[in-house]
């Protein structure tokens, strides 16, 4: 559950980030699990350890394996895994289905392919852009920030883009490309008021102390590709990150479903080691898009043991 | 202690435009939700306009949308309500409201804006 | 739109005395409701959200009840400076919707 797949390219840069968050302040190690030898945090190696992050500047084939983080706090320590592979340069065009980052949709009115794991990088605009190896040039490409924009997208722009940009360590610099497929959608989107499906409003559901709960927040947004829609988990009306409670965590990314033809998103709150505590708080589950914004609140309740004596 | 200071109200002849600001101290005005609420003479409160800390949700009640716009600049710690067309029924005073989760919890001194020939 | 309807839309009472003001939403807004006191010539204040929760600052004597579609602000024991206006408003989701108010007066 806290192990994430990680890959690059020998002789490009890539930094990793431990599955396992918490607070600024917390300490992170790092090893290489095969060996449990502790990966050094001087900028001076080549592989370093920098709190939450792991970088390799730049990767070799032979960085392949599992790296194990662990986030030490005053109370506790939460292990995370990263599972990295590092392949050779493909001498032809052809990028291969292991080195894909998701596929994105786009459509006439929103087409924009965001860079994947760029935010992890020192990296300065523009990011130059390629598809299917050719450098895109015109005015209906706009490189902008980390992602790149398509004026009047056509079914003809479907294919697979890469972005290219360099990370600054230290006045060195390194290449980073990522690629991802993008394909049009060509359906009469609709978008709506958002609509929560789960959870109920008010609904408490039931926990064991000790153990972990997951909570779901789940609603749908319209008809295909929507612009500006999200779900988002707080706690007594505050953002998980600024809560600092490093055992309660929302997923990383949401993902997209399409139900009965609707474009819906979830997002999962793991409370990893249930506390009494856990229970006094107020989880709110809310969905917004350009039209709007809607709440619902899930309580915990402890679930009682069921009782074996006769 | 939380501050939203008002500016901008005034007389103004309908069809013409208004700019309100509000600015803010002592609390991360970046991360704040902001909102707009107005009061007509002698009546109730009524919602106007809502903005997320990085603008990238803007909502309007429907007696304003296509008129008003609410806007931010977190690096002066400042709200706005741009304010066209403006019609006899916007008569009203305007209130700057940090938004908490929906709740209003700390709200500007308010500023009259009187549409009228 | 979420519809607030509050009642009664003015009493009359006297210091010491017990208040209950109600506010009926129009559909089920969980406890996403909110209470404000407004004085003449004054910006709105704060005095209970999520329909039960204290505003820090705000006297005891105030408190906040109910769930889905029916709510109530109680003053237990009127004081001199609670002679105002009050609003109920749910945030369950936009547009944010008040209540017509209600004004408490000096018998």
């Known amino acids: 559950k806290f192990s994430k797949q990680s890959w690059g390219l020998e002789n490009e840069a890539l930094i990793v980030r431990c599955p396992r968050q918490g607070k600024p302040s917390y300490t992170v190690d790092w090893y290489y699990s095969q060996t449990n030898k502790s990966i050094p945090t001087q900028e001076r190696n080549r592989v370093f350890a920098s709190g939450q992050l792991l970088k390799f500047l730049p990767a070799a084939v032979a960085d392949s394996g599992i790296y194990t983080c662990i986030v030490r706090s005053p109370t506790f320590n939460r292990t995370g895994y990263a599972n990295v592979t590092i392949y050779k340069k493909q001498s032809d065009c052809n990028v291969p289905d292991y080195l894909m980052y998701s596929t994105v949709s786009g459509s006439e009115k929103n087409s924009k392919i965001y860079c994947p794991t760029i935010d992890l990088y020192n990296w300065t605009a523009p990011l130059e852009w390629f598809k299917n190896c050719q450098a895109l040039q015109g005015s209906r490409y706009r490189a902008h920030k980390s992602f790149l924009v398509i004026d009047n997208v056509m079914t003809e722009d479907a294919g697979d883009y890469t972005c290219k940009f360099i990370h600054n360590e230290n006045g060195a610099n390194y290449s980073v490309t990522a690629t991802r497929s993008f394909t049009v959608k060509d359906e009469q989107g609709f978008s709506l008021f958002p609509v929560i499906g789960a959870p109920a409003q008010n609904e408490i559901k039931e926990v064991e102390i000790g153990k972990n709960a997951n909570l779901t927040c789940s609603a749908c947004f319209g008809k295909g590709t929507q612009f500006l829609a999200a779900v988002l988990w707080q706690l007594n009306g505050t953002k998980i990150t600024d809560f600092g409670e490093p055992r309660i965590q929302q997923e990383e990314g949401q993902n997209q479903s399409f139900s009965n033809g609707l474009a819906c998103l979830d997002m999962v709150l793991r409370i990893a080691d249930v506390k009494e505590e856990d229970l006094l708080l107020q989880y709110d589950c809310l969905a917004l898009n350009l039209h709007g914004l809607r709440r619902h609140t899930v309580r915990l309740s402890r679930k009682n043991p069921i009782d074996h004596h006769s | 202690e939380v501050q939203l200071l008002q500016s901008g109200g005034g007389l103004v002849q309908p069809g013409g435009s208004l700019r309100l600001s509000c600015a803010a101290s002592e609390f991360t005005f970046s991360n704040a939700w902001m909102s707009w609420v107005r009061q007509a003479p002698g009546k109730g409160l009524e919602w106007v306009s809502t903005?997320?800390?990085?603008?990238?949700?803007?909502y309007y009640a429907d007696s304003v949308k296509g008129r008003f716009t609410i806007s931010r600049d977190n690096s002066k710690n400042s709200l706005y309500l741009q304010m066209n067309s403006l019609r006899a029924e916007d008569t009203a005073v305007y209130y700057c409201a940090r938004d908490q989760d929906g709740r209003l919890d700390y709200w500007g001194q308010g500023t009259l804006v009187t549409v009228s020939s | 739109d979420i519809q607030m309807t509050q009642s009664p839309s003015s009493l009359s009472a006297s210091v010491g005395d017990r208040v209950t003001i109600t506010c009926r939403a129009s559909q089920n807004i969980g406890s996403w409701l909110a209470w404000y006191q407004q004085k003449p010539g004054k910006a709105p204040k704060l005095l209970i959200y999520?329909?039960?929760t204290l505003q820090s600052g705000v006297p005891s004597r105030f408190s906040g009840s109910g769930s889905g579609t029916d709510f109530t602000l109680t003053i237990s024991s009127l004081q001199p400076e609670d002679f105002a206006t009050y609003y109920c408003?749910?945030?369950?989701?936009?547009?944010?919707?008040f209540g017509q108010g209600t004004k408490v007066e000096i018998k």
């Open positions: 408003q749910q945030s369950y989701s936009t547009p944010y919707t």
């Open positions: 903005i997320s800390g990085t603008s990238r949700y803007t």
């Open positions: 999520r329909a039960s």
